[in-house]
Interface confidence: low
């Protein structure tokens, strides 16, 4: 969690002199309670926006917007604390709006916005706006919270952000899977324009239950420049058991920009029903190198029968 690096953070608006400050997420009013405190924010809205850094990088940001209730408590409103909590890491980042002048009622409802919290793809956050000073321990709460889910890198707008492009979101491997004679499976995919190794992982399941019955991993050498955007082929020799027929193939690149955390692409080949002609179903997930798959058994097999284009072991 971090703040977008460029431009001075602004919270002033006509009729209000305001400054944005870093916050420890523990406002002084917790320690020194006040008797008179403002009411809670109204209509808290969180939206996904996109912003450029000074370097020209594009990042997803949380656009936070809320309004004030039209009651007399605005006379005691000294500012607001904005808190963003990343749910899977418990990491929290806060900023404080400090009002340098008193608020007055005017002809329209007071509205505040902040769009400087950088968020990560495929992450969930809890966004809280606390009005300051915070209430005494037994007082009514004067904050509002909302959860905010950031789309993953498959999302059209997200795909072109710097974190997604760094993880390989622009690469479309166009994976095809072909069942050959003699228990073989040929996987083809388009190489990206970088001399980087790839790993192709095959896991097979039985049709009747979600039971992993076969595993193979193949590595592919980093292609030479003249091979960029060409098709790479890997041939796997499958399990001899006819019931071990539901195949899940993943292609994992090791681009220099993401290394252990590159976006993987996968296709699933179901067991044949009538004919062997199957249409692979594309899926993609976002896993680090050290967790080859989520929710399935460990590799049991790494036989190198069959052939592979650019065949390579790290």
């Amino acid at each position: 969690l971090r703040l977008l690096d460029h431009r001075a953070l602004v919270c002033s608006q006509p009729g209000l002199n305001c400054t944005v400050k870093n916050s420890t997420c523990l406002d002084d009013s917790w320690i020194h309670p006040r008797n008179l405190t403002p009411s809670s924010p109204k209509d808290l809205q969180i939206q996904l926006h996109f912003a450029h850094t000074q370097q020209g990088d594009l990042f997803p940001v949380a656009h936070i917007e809320w309004t004030l209730q039209t009651d007399a408590s605005i006379l005691y409103l000294e500012g607001a604390e904005l808190s963003v909590l990343q749910l899977n890491t418990n990491e929290r980042l806060c900023v404080r709006f400090e009002f340098l002048s008193k608020l007055r009622h005017h002809h329209r409802r007071w509205r505040f916005t902040f769009s400087h919290f950088v968020v990560d793809p495929d992450q969930e956050y809890e966004v809280t706006v606390h009005h300051l000073p915070k209430p005494i321990p037994d007082g009514d709460p004067n904050h509002q919270s909302k959860n905010f889910l950031v789309p993953d890198c498959e999302h059209a707008r997200m795909k072109v952000t710097t974190p997604c492009m760094s993880s390989g979101s622009l690469w479309d491997p166009n994976i095809t899977v072909e069942t050959l004679e003699a228990h073989q499976l040929r996987v083809s995919f388009t190489l990206w324009n970088e001399s980087t190794p790839y790993q192709v992982l095959l896991e097979s399941f039985s049709d009747s239950e979600n039971h992993s019955c076969f595993d193979v991993v193949k590595q592919i050498f980093a292609p030479r420049q003249e091979e960029f955007h060409q098709r790479a082929n890997v041939t796997f020799t499958l399990s001899k058991f006819h019931w071990c027929c539901h195949h899940h193939v993943q292609v994992q690149p090791f681009f220099s920009s993401c290394l252990n955390d590159c976006l993987r692409h996968a296709v699933t080949v179901p067991c044949p029903v009538i004919s062997n002609t199957t249409v692979p179903k594309p899926v993609a997930d976002y896993i680090p190198l050290w967790e080859p798959r989520s929710g399935s058994s460990d590799y049991k097999d790494d036989d190198d029968k069959g052939s592979s284009h650019h065949h390579h072991h790290h």
Epitope: L259, W290, H314
Partner: antibody, heavy 118, light 107 residues
């Protein structure tokens, strides 16, 4: 020069807390997953926790789950381990380590010593 | 969780001897195995990754082999500077468990 430097170790009473830091330099920290590994006096290596490059995936050893929190600040090139409810058996040298593409951990810090004792 | 075991737990050999350390996983882990050397008072150093690939800068007398559940680290000609504890580690999925270690010294 690729370097990891741990800090924050010290003596703490059982039930206490400590926050370890690991400062990375000489490589693009934001591209790498990171790990904490510990070694109790006279014992072997024990993997403690893993965090992926953008904090999207986090794992803990069963022995520390619910007590330790791994985090990172890519803008500061820093890795952290917040250790709460510390026990005697958490006494160890704590290393941060960078995974290598293809496997293993190829860059290690020099370690920071945590002693839990009353 | 997958358990990692190493044998022997310690060994003594003469300079120039061929030394073999084995590491066994309780379930198959393909070639997702690394070997480390740790000298007394020092941090561990990566020797081998992907079961058999020598880490850059590591002397060629070290080699690794195996796949699935059984792995071997071999020192073809033991040198005085090889006195250390050697650990295997699996990294196919969390937890990324280490073996208990094998202490190697010179007779």
């Amino acid at each position: 020069e690729v370097q990891l430097v741990e800090s924050g170790g010290g003596l703490v009473q059982p039930g206490g807390s400590l926050r370890l830091s690991c400062a990375a330099s000489g490589f693009t920290f934001s591209s790498y997953s990171m790990n904490w590994v510990r070694q109790a006096p006279g014992k072997g290596l024990e993997w403690v926790s893993f965090i992926s490059a953008r904090s999207s995936t986090i794992y803990y050893a069963d022995s520390v789950k619910g007590r330790f929190t791994i985090s990172r600040d890519n803008a500061k090139n820093s890795l952290y381990l917040q250790m709460n409810s510390l026990r005697d058996e958490d006494t160890a040298v704590y290393y941060c380590a960078r995974p290598k593409v293809g496997g293993g951990m190829d860059v290690w810090g020099q370690g920071t010593t945590v002693t839990v004792s009353s | 969780d997958i358990q990692m075991t190493q044998s022997p737990s310690s060994l003594s050999a003469s300079v120039g001897d061929r030394v073999t350390i084995t590491c066994r996983a309780s379930q198959g882990i393909s070639n997702y195995l690394a070997w480390y050397q740790q000298k007394p008072g020092k941090f561990p150093e990566l020797l081998i990754y992907a079961a058999s690939t020598l880490q850059s800068g590591v002397p060629s007398r070290f080699s690794g082999s195996g796949s699935g559940t059984d792995f071997t680290l071999t020192i073809s000609s033991l040198q005085p500077e090889d006195v250390a504890t050697y650990y295997c580690q699996k990294y196919n999925r969390a937890p990324f468990t280490f073996g208990p270690g094998t202490k190697v010294d010179i007779k």
